[in-house]
Interface confidence: medium
Amino acid sequence: MNGRVDYLVTEEEINLTRGPSGLGFNIVGGTDQQYVSNDSGIYVSRIKENGAAALDGRLQEGDKILSVNGQDLKNLLHQDAVDLFRNAGYAVSLRVQHRLQVQNGPIGHRGEGDPSGIPIFMVLVPVFALTMVAAWAFMRYRQQL
């Protein structure tokens, strides 16, 4: 099956205030530790329970962080990116890219949010049509009596 996975990409500016235990998330990525093939970007890999990011609620695991306090995260070594976060101060502004998976393709394609891979309307439309045909046949049958 050649179902295509499309992504709805949105960007958001998230302002976090460093909490008692910091910003409260983990990252992967960097030029020396590519998380996504052909992409050395920095991605959120874990949101820590009760941390600043978790309490804010906007940052999600899988988000790509584009910049910290206006500083671009492109082409950085992993540890350099880590250090940038650690030295970012009390108020931290993150430019973040969210990727929402959208299903687009034939019936056999399995989307992340739909375990059966079949959109609900693909089931409802035939059921509705069958119901209408059965009702019409029943009415015709009654008229003949």
């Epitope: 910091g22 910003l23 990525g29 991605y43 874990r46």
Partner: nanobody, 128 residues
């Protein structure tokens, strides 16, 4: 998923040395931060030492600082705890733990149990 198996525990006399090993099986061991914890009889499990995924950062509980050394060999998927100048109060079951999910932007030093995703069954160390 990561499976952790500790070995190297035993009964030793005070002042002796012991090296614990923790062999990991499963995917990408080299990206996991590793830690050692211990639980003495009748006490809560406590943090002993941790090492970052690169091996570049280590951190120790005050009670073992200068006596214990944590290290790792990513080629062998193994983390070690070298314990010198052992004391009777070091008697405990020692647990190896692994934490996935990249690097914390806050600290390399994960000292809380809840930070860790995978745990071994433990190995007994008794110092007489």
């Amino acid at each position: 998923h990561v499976q952790l198996v500790e070995s190297g525990g035993g009964l030793v006399q005070a002042g002796a040395s012991l090296t614990l090993s923790c062999a990991a099986s499963g995917r990408s061991f080299s990206t996991y931060h590793m830690g050692w914890f211990r639980q003495a009889p009748g006490k809560e499990r406590e943090f002993v030492a941790t090492i970052s995924w690169t091996g570049g950062s280590t951190y120790y509980a005050d009670s073992v600082k200068g006596r214990f050394t944590i290290s790792r060999d990513n080629a062998k998927n193994t983390v070690y705890l070298q314990m010198n100048s052992l004391k009777p109060e070091d008697t405990a079951v020692y647990y190896c733990a692994a934490r996935g999910g990249g690097t914390s932007v806050d600290s390399d030093y994960d000292v809380e149990e809840f930070e860790y995703d995978y745990w071994g069954q433990g190995t007994q160390v008794t110092v007489s």
